[in-house]
């Protein structure tokens, strides 16, 4: 650190601060009196480069003026951008042991004079704001940089306010601190920016703006909607603005939506009626203004309006399907299932179902209310029977959906023809049918209906159902599909008053079972032999298995074991074989086949017939 | 008792300068708008330059001064200056300082004589040609 130059002098030429490939030269001169003691003619002057405080050149060879043990001239070039500090020292020649003592320092920055300040852009957020300009500085000048904004408008007034930029801060954005009112609407303002430092100075190109230009509405606050007698489809929106708003936005969407409604609305004095909206439905209001009609730019929008719209009574039909199942010689029962409405159709919380069945000839009527998708009664076995369901929220009820109770398998000539289901991918199987032959009535729809092939599921699970119009033959089923998984598949063709279905098993994804059958028991029986086992539990089965195989081969044996294949059957679990020998003892396994393949073999056996073999 | 000293006018020759400073005692200026206004005889007072008093001082100046006057102040010694170079002899007048009691935004109320609160006696220039 130079504090106080006591031995001497550093001047620079031609000035402290030089343009970006200058020359300087710098001279050193030792006060009167100072030096080396005894021998002046040994006083050596040396001078020393740092850049960032780290040394980086000894300058001695740069020397263009030498007064011997008075003064010395260095000329230093290729100075780089930024500040360099030279150090003189003086180096007593005759004493190499004392290190050489500082005499003075100089500073040399070197930089670009600056360009033209470009693309001034001011702006004035609200009526009350401040008028705030930004400019694009140019090139960094690597020098302390003075900016000077000036503003120039109607009553013969100039403000101007001014910042600088060096290597701590930068300087391309000034708030004037002054406010621009509506009554200078028609006022031409001018602005420039001038930019001066020790090298050179610019000014930009004037840029000429009037109030409309510059003023950016603040947006629209205290948002809020009022809907008309609590409809749930129309709404006023209200909000406050500033007073010299004349256009506005707005723009809503249900949450979950990825596109705006956007709605222009003149003159609107923060009100504006909406006439589209869905009931019960979270919705996102913004609304944006504008100070003009053609010109000036819109706010930023407001904050959010987040809301829901109120409930208006259900539309549309509830989706009915039903199962019936006789329980004795005169009554049977009835569950009925119908799917939940979609949020546009239901309009609200759905508080309960309206569920009517009713005899059509005696008239009788069974009616309950319940918040399930489900309804179980026992009825006569005898009379023509009709459902109806309808939905309600606390605004009202859907039309009620009837459907009549026919017999569903009851009518082999409405038996659907070439039932086929194909997997297409790992969660649909494509399902696809021939209509009946010989229906003597027409078929008014097809019912596509599975269920996972699962202990229980007719009792623990629903059926899921597509309704197919009569001209389609085909049905994509993706609803609860999972691979690796059998399904019952039934189709069902209705007519008025009749039902005839068919049925078949399908999976979306299938492999060869984890295992095959368990042998619980080989039985003989008039010479033949009867084989019992249980299915392969449901979770092993992994999707839908064709047949089983019966393998046997003589104990001992190295032959290959003879098989017989079985359709797969679920309320099969024994078969018959007859063609092995008395009094041999035999080993006997099984397998399970899908479309993937075929499963390891379940469980050995040894029996040895006893009878007289065919 | 607030009171505001014009001192640094007098008899100038045409093309001199002059360094006019307005003291203000009895309240503190430093965050509030101060201003120069001139009235030559005959004629009204009329604007010459002013401080706005909001963050970091916005200058204003009335066109006809603007480059050969500059209004600057010292919040600390409760001073205001106006530095007039290249004086013309249509500058001559008796120049007032003047001090609001609040920060000035509004472009148009700046010029205004309303606006300001506290004046001072006035201190007279002369240019003589």
């Known amino acids: 650190n130079i504090d106080v130059c006591k031995l001497g002098t550093v001047t620079v030429q031609p000035a402290p601060v030089i343009p970006l490939g200058s020359a300087a030269n710098i001279s050193c001169s030792l006060n009167p009196k100072q030096g080396c003691s005894h021998y002046p003619s040994s006083n050596e002057l040396i001078l020393l480069k740092f850049v960032n405080d780290v040394l980086v050149e000894n300058l001695h060879g740069k020397k263009v003026h030498d007064h011997t043990g008075h003064s010395s001239t260095f000329q230093v070039t290729n100075l780089s951008l930024g500040m360099t500090l030279f150090v003189c020292k003086l180096n007593c020649s005759n004493s190499q042991k004392k290190p050489p003592v500082p005499v003075c320092g100089v500073e040399i920055s070197v930089g670009v004079a600056p360009e033209p300040p470009q693309n001034i852009s001011c702006v004035q957020e609200g009526e009350n704001g401040t008028v705030a300009c930004s400019w694009n500085s140019g090139k960094v000048t690597y020098l302390k940089t003075n900016y000077t904004l000036q503003l120039s408008g109607p009553n013969n007034l100039t403000c101007q306010k001014q910042c600088f930029s060096d290597n701590r801060q930068n300087c391309n954005r000034l708030d004037l601190g002054i406010n621009l009112s509506p009554d200078l609407a028609e006022s031409r303002f001018i602005v420039r920016v001038t930019a001066i430092n020790d090298l050179g100075n610019s000014s930009s190109l004037p840029h000429t703006f009037t109030f409309l230009d510059i003023v950016i509405p603040l947006p629209p606050w205290d948002i809020r909607i009022n809907f008309l007698n609590a409809s749930g489809s129309r709404g006023t929106l209200q909000w406050e603005d500033e007073g010299q708003v004349v256009l506005n936005q707005l723009r809503y969407q249900p949450l979950n939506s990825t596109s705006w409604n956007m709605v222009n609305a003149t003159n609107a004095k923060g009100k504006y009626d909406l006439r589209d909206l869905r009931p019960f439905t979270e919705y996102e209001f913004q609304i944006s203004s504008k100070l003009h009609l053609s010109g000036g730019s819109w706010s930023n929008w407001s904050e959010s309006l987040r809301t829901r719209t109120p409930e208006e009574e259900p539309v549309g039909i509830l989706d009915i399907w039903y199962m019936k199942q006789d329980i004795d010689y005169d009554r049977q029962q009835i569950s009925l299932f119908w799917k939940s409405l979609n949020p546009s159709e239901a309009r609200g919380k759905i508080l309960h179902y309206q569920v009517t069945l009713q005899e059509v000839t005696k008239k009788t009527t069974l009616q309950n209310t319940t918040r399930h998708t489900s309804w179980t009664r026992v009825i006569p076995r005898t009379g023509a029977w009709t459902a109806s369901v309808s939905a309600a929220n606390s605004k009202g009820a859907s039309a009620p959906t009837h459907i009549n109770i026919v017999d569903l398998c009851g009518t082999g000539l409405l038996a659907p023809h070439q039932v086929s289901a194909k997997s297409e991918n790992m969660d649909n199987i494509l399902v696809t049918w021939q209509p009946p032959k010989k229906a003597d009535s027409a078929v008014r729809e097809y019912i596509v209906e599975w269920r996972a092939l699962q202990p229980g599921s007719i009792t623990k699970f629903p059926p899921h159902w597509l309704r197919i119009p009569p001209d389609n033959m085909s049905a994509l089923i993706s609803e609860n599909i999972k691979p690796y998984i059998c399904y019952e598949i039934r189709v069902h063709a209705l007519s008025e008053s009749q039902g005839g279905c068919s049925s078949i098993r399908g999976d979306s994804k299938h492999k060869a079972p984890v295992s095959g059958p368990h042998i619980t028991a080989i039985t003989e029986k008039k010479e033949r032999l009867f084989i019992s086992w249980t299915h392969i539990p449901f979770p092993e089965q992994r999707g839908c298995i064709l047949h089983y195989r019966i393998y046997w081969k003589e104990r001992d044996s190295t032959a290959q074991p003879e098989l017989c294949e079985i359709q797969y059957r679920r309320s099969q679990n024994s078969h018959p074989i007859s063609s092995l020998q008395p009094r041999v003892t035999y080993v006997l396994w099984m397998t399970a086949v899908t479309a993937a393949g075929e499963s390891p073999q379940g469980n050995e056996r040894e029996f040895c017939p006893q009878g007289k073999a065919n | 008792q607030v009171q505001l000293q014009e001192s640094g006018g007098g008899l100038v020759q045409d093309g001199g300068s002059l360094r006019l400073s307005c003291a203000a005692s009895?309240?503190?200026?430093?965050?509030?708008?101060m201003a120069w206004f001139r009235q030559a005889p005959g004629t009204e007072r009329e604007f010459v330059a002013g401080l706005s008093g909001s963050g970091g001082d916005t200058a204003f100046y009335d066109n006809s001064v603007m480059g050969r006057f500059t209004i600057s102040r010292d919040s600390a010694k409760n001073t205001m200056w106006l530095q007039i170079n290249n004086l013309k002899p249509e500058d001559t007048a008796v120049y007032y300082c003047?001090?609001?009691?609040?920060?000035?935004?509004?472009?148009?109320?700046?010029?205004?004589?309303?606006?300001?609160?506290?004046w001072g006696q006035g201190t007279q220039v002369t240019v003589s040609s």
């Open positions: 003047a001090a609001a009691t609040h920060v000035v935004v509004s472009y148009g109320l700046v010029r205004k004589r309303g606006t300001y609160d506290y």
């Open positions: 009895g309240r503190t200026f430093s965050n509030y708008a």
